[in-house]
Every structure is written in structure tokens, then in C-alpha cells.
């Protein structure tokens, strides 16, 4: 049993870190492997994560890691029974993948604009709450070439969109993702799409 691609790990910097790796042949991850993890200092408590299969040879482990601070370094050890397959260190603050923004909704607004609103996935007391910027992707459901990308770099999780910038009578979908610039994070996963019909009158809520 061998590791082909070593674990790649990301933290949401609030409660969970996820590691994914590839074995050199199809593996029943939960039956054959265990990922142990602990803060890297003498005497720290060791925890065990039971991985799940993502594909035949790809394993993924979700580790509850609460109250991460910037200096925290975790030691990760991948075991197949008594055999140590791989050992590595992981610093959550240097491998942040924000949580996915939630509840993306489209409302009609004054002056022929659409108001896109979503929720910041972090509570106000979390470091990342005030660090997030967003990318909104708006695409025409019937025309793959008709899409727009908006970078939302201001604080509020909202975007105003002039209806006139979209084709009248067309169905549009929007989705949003987040990143944290000061943590040099990766992008979050995309939110589920929300769909609406772009027309100018009457202005009803959608």
C-alpha cells in the first residue's frame, strides 16, 4: 500500500480541515487507512480520522479542528495498520479554503436593477468574517457565451446589477464564491446557483 499523491489539506479556519490524497491503486480508504493528527508539540493529544473514498484511489478525511490560531501546526500521519505510509505537517492558517457563501437570493430593486444578496459564512467574531471578498458569476442559461464575472471587494455580501446589462427575457443563473486575501486562501467552493428571469416590468420579488 503506497501513497501516490501526498495529502493536500485545507482549513475553513473555524471548525474543519479536510485532507485529500491519492493511493497508488484502488483502496477501501475507511477499511485500510487511518489519518492521525495532533498539534505539533510534545505531549499533545493524538486524534484519528477515518477517511472516505472520493474515487477508487482517492481518499478524503474531514478533521474537526476548532479554534485555530495562526501559529498552530498539525502533524499528520497516514497509517495502513501498523505501517506508516506518509508523515507531514500542516499549518491551517497557511492553507485556508473559506466556507461557501450561503443563501444567494435575487431581488428586484429600484431603477431597473437586480439586487443579489448572500450570507457571509462566518460569524462576526471569526477572523475571516471581515476578510472575505467575493466573486459572482452570472450566466445566461441558454447562451454559454453570455456570462459575466463580478469581483465584490467591499464588505457587504451584495451586488447590484443593472437589468439592462443582461438580455431581456432571458433566464440567468448566479453563483458566488469567497476568498480571504490576507490569508492568501484558495477560493471557496461555488454556492448553489439561483436562477431568475431578466425582465424590466413588473418588479416583483423572486
Amino acid at each position: 500500500v503506497k501513497v501516490l499523491h501526498e495529502p493536500s489539506c485545507f482549513s475553513d479556519y473555524i471548525s474543519t480541515s479536510v485532507c485529500q490524497w491519492k493511493m497508488d491503486h484502488p483502496t477501501n480508504c475507511s477499511a485500510e487507512l487511518r489519518l492521525s493528527y495532533q498539534l505539533d508539540f510534545m505531549g499533545s493529544e493524538n486524534h484519528t480520522c477515518v477517511p472516505e473514498n472520493r474515487e477508487d484511489s482517492v481518499c478524503v478525511c474531514s478533521m474537526p479542528i476548532d479554534d485555530a490560531v495562526e501559529a498552530d501546526v498539525y502533524q499528520l500521519d497516514l497509517w495502513a495498520g501498523q505501517q506508516l505510509l506518509w508523515s507531514g505537517s500542516f499549518q491551517p492558517s497557511k492553507h485556508v479554503k473559506p466556507r461557501t457563501p450561503g443563501n444567494l437570493t435575487v431581488y428586484p430593486n429600484i431603477s431597473h436593477t437586480w439586487l443579489l444578496m448572500w450570507t457571509n459564512p462566518y460569524p462576526t467574531e471569526n477572523h475571516l468574517h471581515s476578510e472575505l471578498t467575493y466573486m459572482v458569476n452570472v450566466s445566461n442559461d441558454n447562451d454559454p457565451e453570455d456570462f459575466k464575472v463580478y469581483n465584490v471587494t467591499y464588505m457587504g455580501p451584495t451586488l447590484r446589477l443593472a437589468a439592462s446589462t443582461l438580455k431581456s427575457g432571458a433566464s440567468y443563473s448566479a453563483r458566488v464564491r469567497a476568498w480571504a486575501q490576507t490569508y492568501n486562501s484558495t477560493w471557496s467552493d461555488w454556492s448553489p446557483s439561483t436562477t431568475w428571469l431578466n425582465y424590466y416590468e413588473p418588479w416583483e420579488q423572486h
Epitope: L39, D40, M42, Q75, D77, W86, S87, G88, S89
Partner: antibody
Framework: EVKLVESGGGLVQPGGSLKLSCVAS????????MHWVRQTPEKRLEWVAY????????YYPDTEKGRFTISRDNAKNTLYLQMSRLKSEDTAMYYC???????????????WGTGTTVTVSS | DIQMTQSPASLSASVGETVTITCRAS??????LAWYQQKQGKSPQLLVY???TLAEGVPSRFSGSGSGTQFSLKINSLQPEDFGSYYC?????????VGVGTKLELK
């Protein structure tokens, strides 16, 4: 200048104990995983022990488990190897060595110490 | 454990010659192979890692190649300071193991 300097070697009787030290300078010691590697009189190189950056994890080859203990003091920039129940086969030059990366896929050694000689003989 | 087999055990060459040392792994180690040089009475020094990446400060006359189970270290235009022992080591899986070495002597 990046430097590792070992000390503590010497002549010891079979069954005896010895503690080796390695002082690091010229780099941020706490940023690196560290190892002990030995070279036998026949010039064979053998990996002996590993310790993570913060000292939370240690590993040994099966042959040394239970007899050797690796530890570190990051405040003193010092790596240690406590050896007990020594055998004649443990006679070797002992080197401390640095591995440059975050995981065992990087367990090659980019900086080596000058070495300290351990002789186990009655 | 993965066994590393080096050949030849020793070879003689002259300054200016090109030599090749080979290393075989008992199983697939992809490109996780390092080469070291050790001069008489000195510590080993890293030459190559990941099979072909030269370590910092290593002259370009050294080159590593291979993947899977077969690897080689080539030294072009041998210089007087190149004579000594050479070792290969896999860095794929635990424990890491080292070949018995190749002694390169001046003819």
C-alpha cells in the same frame, strides 16, 4: 553559515547508554524536521530517527524502536538522541541531518552535521 | 522496506572523463530519489533530489535521471574534487533507505 555540530559520542560498553547532541546555527531550527543518520564502519548509511518541527512526532526504523529516543529543544536550537541498550552493531559515525520539506516525501537531507563517533565495545 | 542497489561498487576514471553511476529500487519509487557525494573524512553532501533536481550550489556537470525503479547519476568532465563515494537514497515511503555506495577513484 548553515551549520550542524554533533557531540556526545565516545566508547561505551554493550548494554550501556549514551546521549548525543546536535547544535544548529545559521537557520531557523524550529522550521525544520530533523533526523539522525549513522554511517557504519563499512560505510553504509542508515536512517536512525526522525522528529517533527515542534517535537510532537517521532519515528524510528523497526530495528531501533524502544532503544533510541530523539528529542529537540527549539529554544536551544538543539537536537538530541538518547541511545540505550547499545549493541556492537550500533558502532558508527552519527550525523544529525535536516530535511527541507513539510512531509516524508522530502526526507532527503540537505544539511548534515560533522558527525560524532560512537563505539560500542567491551 | 525498499531496497536500493547501486552499481558499480567502485570505478576508476581520469580527470576529464564522463562517468555514470546507476541505482535500482526494489519497487516503484516514481521520482523520489536523492544522490549524495561523500569525500574521505567528510560528511555526505546532497547533490540531487527528486531524481533530477540539482541541489543548491552543485555544478552543472552533475545530472540525475530516471524514474520508477531505474536511476542514474552522470558526471561530465570529471574534476579532481569529484572523486569520493556516491550514494543513492529513496525518499518515497518510510523508512528511507540508502544504497551501499559507489566509490569513484582516480585512475
Amino acid at each position: 553559515e548553515v551549520k550542524l555540530v554533533e557531540s556526545g559520542g565516545g566508547l561505551v560498553q554493550p548494554g550501556g547508554s549514551l546521549k548525543l547532541s546536535c547544535v544548529a546555527s545559521g537557520f531557523t531550527f524550529s522550521d525544520y524536521h530533523m533526523h539522525w543518520v549513522r554511517q557504519t564502519p563499512e560505510k553504509r548509511l542508515e536512517w536512525v530517527a526522525y522528529i517533527s518541527k515542534g517535537g510532537g512526532s517521532t519515528y524510528y526504523p523497526d530495528t531501533e524502536k524502544g532503544r533510541f529516543t530523539i528529542s529537540r529543544d527549539n529554544a536551544k536550537n538543539t537536537l538530541y538522541l538518547q541511545m540505550s541498550r547499545l549493541k556492537s552493531e550500533d558502532t558508527a559515525m552519527y550525523y544529525c541531518a535536516r530535511s527541507p520539506g513539510p512531509s516524508s516525501f522530502y526526507w532527503y537531507f540537505d544539511v548534515w552535521g560533522t558527525g560524532t563517533t560512537v563505539t560500542v565495545s567491551s | 522496506d525498499i531496497q536500493m542497489t547501486q552499481s558499480p561498487a567502485s570505478l576508476s576514471a581520469s580527470v576529464g572523463e564522463t562517468v555514470t553511476i546507476t541505482c535500482r529500487a526494489s519497487e516503484n519509487i516514481y521520482s523520489y530519489l536523492a544522490w549524495y557525494q561523500q569525500k574521505q573524512g567528510k560528511s555526505p553532501q546532497l547533490l540531487v533530489y527528486n531524481a533530477k533536481t540539482l541541489a543548491e550550489g552543485v555544478p552543472s556537470r552533475f545530472s540525475g535521471s530516471g524514474s520508477g525503479t531505474q536511476f542514474s547519476l552522470k558526471i561530465n568532465s570529471l574534476q579532481p574534487e569529484d572523486f569520493g563515494s556516491y550514494y543513492c537514497q529513496h525518499h518515497y515511503g518510510i523508512p528511507v533507505t540508502v544504497g551501499v555506495g559507489t566509490k569513484l577513484e582516480l585512475k
